[in-house]
C-alpha cells in the first residue's frame, strides 16, 4: 500500500473548483522533494499537469496551483473552472519522476443538475432573507392564501392570510400583497437557517380550483474562501455582509471544537492571543468591514467566520462569511524575535524587514492602540515627519536595498511599552509587529553625554563628549543631528573656516563633538550612538541650547538645521554620503489609512538591540571626502 494518502473520489460540478489535499509521511526528504499531480492515460502513463518545481501544463494554465505545506506534511492541488473534460483518473505523488510514491484519485465532474420546470428554485445564503412569489388567478383573489413546507407525510403550514404563523417562523415570516395587483402574493422569510431549506407549496384557494406553485428553497452555508499565507506575514479578512446588517455589531470568530470563538468584534472584545496584531475596520455604511491580523503564527491556521449581530457574537440565522486560512511555514519573511527589551532612559534599535524587491517603497512605523476597534497612528516614516511628542528621540533610518530599515527610539519611558508595527506602502504581507517592553533601569546607561545641561554660546567653541564602555570599543561611534526628518550623521570634512571636530580618547573611551564657532542653527537635539556596519546599537540624546553671551538660558526649541561638525572615530573617518530626498506629505499607505493612521501590520522583531543613529537623511545632503585627523589621547 502507498504511504501517500488523499481522497480516493472527488466529485464536483462544471464551473466549480476543487482543492485536493495529499498527505505524505513525515520525513525531511519528503518535505523537500518534488510534488506532482498527473493524469493517468489508457496506456498507464501518467502525464504531469502541475508540479512543485514550477511546471504547469497548458490545460491548467491560469486555473490551477500546487502548494506544499511541509509543516503539515501535505500538499494541496487547487483546480478551478472545472469542465466535464476534467473527469478522469489522477495521481498525486512525490519524487523526481511520476513513478515515485503516489496515490490514485478519481475526479468526476458532472453537469449542473436540471430541476423540474414547474418548480421555482430560490438559492439563498444562511442569514439572508427570501421573498417567494406566489401567482394566482383573479377568481381566487378573495380566497385564503398560504405557504406550507413539505414534510414526509404532509405540508406543514408556514403562514397564511388569516395571520396564522408556524411557531418556528414567528417574527421571520410575512405574507403580503403589493399595491393593487390581485394576481400575486408574496411571502418573505428572514434570518434563514439550514432548517428552512426544502420544498414549499404556495396556494390560493381551496379544492380543485386552487392555484398552487412548487418552490425549492436552497439555503447555503457560505463557501469558505481559501487563504494561503506565509508564516509571519499578514492576512486581511474582507467581510461584506450587506446593507441589512450595516448597523449591527460585527465580529470575526474562529471555529473551535464546539463553538466559534470571537477573536475581535466592534463592541471592544478582543482575544488576548491577538493583542497588538489585530485591527477591525468598518469600511462603509453597507455592512462592509475588514479584519487585519499580522504576525501570522502556525496556530492561526483554521476556519474563520465573520458575521453581524447586536450581541457581537455568532447567532444562527444571521449572515456570515467564511475562510479557511492556511499558514505556510516556508516563509519569505525573515524570522526575528517579536519582543524588544529596553530600560527607562535607554534606547532601542528595531530592524524592520521589508520586501527587498521594493527598496524604494515608503517605510513607516506606527504604534498599535487597542482602544475601540484598534488603530495604528504613524509615528515616523520615510516621508512623514516625526510626531511632535517624539521630538528628539525617534528616527527612521532607511538602508536602501538590503531589505531592512531601522527605527530608533531613545529616552525610553515605561509609557513607551506596547506594540509597534513596521509597514510599507508596498507588499502588504511584510507588515510586522514587535512588542516593546520597558523595564526600570537598574544601572547607569552605557552611553553618557557631558555636559548634561548643554548651553552653547553663540560664536564660541562648544564641545560635548560621549562616554562609552570598552565593550563598544570596536564599534563605530557617531554623532548625528536630529531633525523631524531623521538623524543626519555629521559629515567628516572641513567646512571652511568653521572648524568643528570630533576625537576619541582611548583612555577614557569618549567621542567628542566640537561646534566651532557656534551658530543659532546649531541649536537642537544631537544623538551619540554606536553601530556595526548597518546594524545600529545604542544611542543617547542631548539637547544643545544656543544663547548669546549676555542672555540667560535659551528656551529649548529644536530646529531642523543640521550642525556642521566633523566626526573622526578611532582610526577611521565616517564618510557620510547621504542622498537628498524631498519632504513630501505622507501618502495614503493602505486601504484603511485615515490621515496619519495606517491599519496594516505584521509580526517580527528583535530583542534588546539598543538604539543608534536613525538618519533617514530626508534633510540636507552631504557628500564628503574622507580625511585623516590627528587624535588627542
Amino acid at each position: 500500500k502507498s504511504p501517500i494518502f488523499g481522497p480516493q473520489e472527488v466529485s464536483s460540478i462544471e464551473g466549480d473548483s476543487v482543492s485536493i489535499t495529499c498527505y505524505y509521511p513525515d520525513t525531511s526528504v519528503n518535505r523537500h522533494t518534488r510534488k506532482y499531480w498527473c493524469r493517468q492515460g489508457a496506456s498507464g502513463m501518467c502525464t504531469t499537469l502541475i508540479s512543485s518545481n514550477g511546471y504547469l501544463s497548458k490545460e491548467y494554465s491560469g486555473r490551477a496551483n500546487l502548494i506544499n505545506f511541509p509543516e503539515n506534511n501535505t500538499f494541496v492541488i487547487n483546480i478551478e473552472q472545472l469542465t466535464q473534460d476534467d473527469t478522469g483518473s489522477y495521481k498525486c505523488g512525490l519524487g523526481t519522476s511520476n513513478r515515485g510514491l503516489s496515490f490514485d484519485v478519481s475526479l468526476e465532474v458532472s453537469q449542473v443538475p436540471e430541476l423540474p420546470s414547474d418548480t421555482h428554485v430560490y438559492t439563498k445564503d444562511i442569514g439572508r432573507n427570501v421573498t417567494i412569489e406566489c401567482p394566482f388567478k383573479r377568481e381566487n383573489a378573495p380566497s385564503k392564501k398560504s405557504l406550507c413546507k413539505k414534510t414526509n407525510q404532509s405540508c406543514e403550514l408556514v403562514i397564511d392570510s388569516t395571520e396564522k404563523v408556524n411557531p418556528s417562523y414567528i417574527g421571520r415570516a410575512k405574507l403580503f400583497m403589493k399595491g393593487t395587483d390581485l394576481t400575486v402574493f408574496y411571502v418573505n422569510i428572514s434570518h434563514l437557517t439550514h432548517n428552512d431549506a426544502g420544498l414549499y407549496i404556495c396556494q390560493a384557494g381551496e379544492g380543485p380550483s386552487a392555484d398552487k406553485k412548487n418552490v425549492d428553497l436552497q439555503v447555503l452555508a457560505p463557501e469558505p474562501e481559501l487563504l494561503y499565507k506565509d508564516l509571519r506575514s499578514s492576512v486581511t479578512f474582507e467581510c461584506d455582509l450587506g446593507r441589512e446588517v450595516a448597523n449591527e455589531a460585527k465580529y470575526l470568530c474562529r471555529m473551535n471544537k464546539e463553538t466559534c470563538d470571537v477573536i475581535i468584534n466592534t463592541l471592544g472584545k478582543r482575544d488576548p492571543d491577538f493583542e497588538g496584531r489585530i485591527l477591525i475596520t468598518p469600511k462603509d455604511d453597507n455592512g462592509r468591514f475588514s479584519v487585519l491580523i499580522t504576525g501570522l503564527r502556525k496556530e492561526d491556521a483554521g476556519h474563520y467566520q465573520c458575521g453581524a449581530h447586536s450581541s457581537g457574537l455568532p447567532q444562527e440565522g444571521w449572515p456570515i462569511q467564511t475562510w479557511q486560512l492556511f499558514v505556510n511555514e516556508e516563509s519569505t519573511i525573515p524570522n526575528r524575535r517579536s519582543v524588544v527589551k529596553g530600560v527607562t532612559g535607554g534606547s532601542v534599535a528595531i530592524a524592520c524587514p521589508y520586501n527587498p524587491k521594493e527598496s524604494s517603497s515608503l517605510k513607516y512605523w506606527c504604534r498599535w492602540e487597542g482602544d475601540g476597534n484598534g488603530h495604528c497612528p504613524v509615528l515616523v516614516g520615510t516621508q512623514a515627519q516625526v510626531q511632535e511628542e517624539y521630538e528628539g528621540r525617534l528616527a527612521l533610518f532607511d538602508q536602501p536595498g538590503n531589505g531592512t530599515y531601522t527605527v530608533i527610539l531613545n529616552q525610553l519611558t515605561t509609557e513607551d511599552a506596547g506594540f509597534y508595527w513596521c509597514l510599507t506602502n508596498g507588499d502588504s504581507r511584510w507588515r510586522t509587529t514587535i512588542e516593546l517592553q520597558v523595564a526600570e533601569a537598574t544601572r547607569e546607561p552605557n552611553l553618557e553625554v557631558t555636559p548634561q545641561n548643554a548651553t552653547a554660546v553663540l560664536g564660541e567653541t562648544f564641545t560635548v563628549s560621549c562616554h562609552y564602555p570598552c565593550k563598544f570599543y570596536s564599534q563605530e561611534k557617531y554623532w548625528c543631528k536630529w531633525s523631524n526628518k531623521g538623524c543626519h550623521i555629521l559629515p567628516s570634512h572641513d567646512e571652511g573656516a568653521r572648524q568643528s571636530s570630533v576625537s576619541c580618547d582611548q583612555s577614557s573611551q569618549l567621542v567628542s563633538m566640537t561646534l566651532n564657532p557656534v551658530s543659532k542653527e546649531d541649536e537642537g537635539w544631537y544623538w551619540c550612538g554606536v553601530k556595526q556596519g548597518q546594524t545600529y546599537g545604542e544611542t543617547t540624546a542631548i539637547y544643545i541650547a544656543v544663547e548669546e553671551r549676555t542672555r540667560g538660558s535659551s528656551h529649548v526649541n529644536p530646529t531642523d538645521a543640521n550642525a556642521r561638525a566633523k566626526v573622526a572615530l578611532e582610526e577611521e573617518v565616517v564618510d557620510s554620503s547621504i542622498s537628498e530626498k524631498e519632504n513630501k506629505a505622507i501618502p495614503n499607505p493602505g486601504p484603511f489609512a485615515n490621515e496619519r493612521e495606517i491599519q496594516n501590520v505584521g509580526d517580527q522583531a528583535q530583542e534588546n538591540r539598543a538604539s543608534g543613529d536613525a538618519g533617514s537623511a530626508d534633510g540636507q545632503s552631504r557628500s564628503s571626502s574622507s580625511k585623516h585627523h590627528h587624535h588627542h589621547h
Epitope: P7, Q8, V10, S11, S12, D16, V18, H194
Partner: nanobody
Framework: QVQLVESGGGLVQAGDSLRLSCAAS????????MGWFRQAPGKEREFVTT??????????YYADSVKGRFTISRDNAKNTVYLQMNSLKPDDTAVYYC?????????????????WGQGTQVTVSS
C-alpha cells in the same frame, strides 16, 4: 452543538451487505466533514471512511482495508451520511461510530473530529 445518531447496525453473514445511517442535528451548518470509525474489542479506534464537502464538491476518503467494498455518501437535505458496506468479512465486526468535524486537517485522525455518535454494533459471522 451538533448531535449525531447512528442506526442500521446488526448481525449479518459474511459476504452480506449492511447500510448504516448517521443523522446530524443542531448547528450542522458548521460541519465540514463527516465520517465513520470503528472499534473492535480490545483494539484502538480505526478510521474507516470520511466525506468532506465544500459547496457542491465532495471528497471521499477510505481506509485501504475497506476500499472497493464500502461506499460513503450523504444527503445534504436530510443532514445524513450513509455507509454502504458490501462483501462484509468477520474482520469488519466492531462498533461503528459516526464523527463530524468543523475543521479537518487529516481525516484519518480521530482527534480531528469534534462530535461523535454513541456507536452502532456491526457483527459479521462466518
Amino acid at each position: 452543538q451538533v448531535q449525531l445518531v447512528e442506526s442500521g447496525g446488526g448481525l449479518v453473514q459474511a459476504g452480506d451487505s449492511l447500510r448504516l445511517s448517521c443523522a446530524a442535528s443542531g448547528r450542522t451548518f458548521t460541519t465540514y466533514g463527516m465520517g465513520w470509525f470503528r472499534q473492535a474489542p480490545g483494539k484502538e479506534r480505526e478510521f474507516v471512511t470520511t466525506i468532506t464537502w465544500s459547496g457542491s464538491t465532495n471528497y471521499k476518503y477510505y481506509a485501504d482495508s475497506v476500499k472497493g467494498r464500502f461506499t460513503i455518501s450523504r444527503d445534504n437535505a436530510k443532514n445524513t451520511v450513509y455507509l454502504q458496506m458490501n462483501s462484509l468479512k468477520p474482520d469488519d465486526t466492531a462498533v461503528y461510530y459516526c464523527a463530524a468535524s468543523t475543521v479537518l486537517r487529516d481525516p484519518r485522525v480521530p482527534t480531528e473530529y469534534d462530535y461523535w455518535g454513541q456507536g452502532t454494533q456491526v457483527t459479521v459471522s462466518s
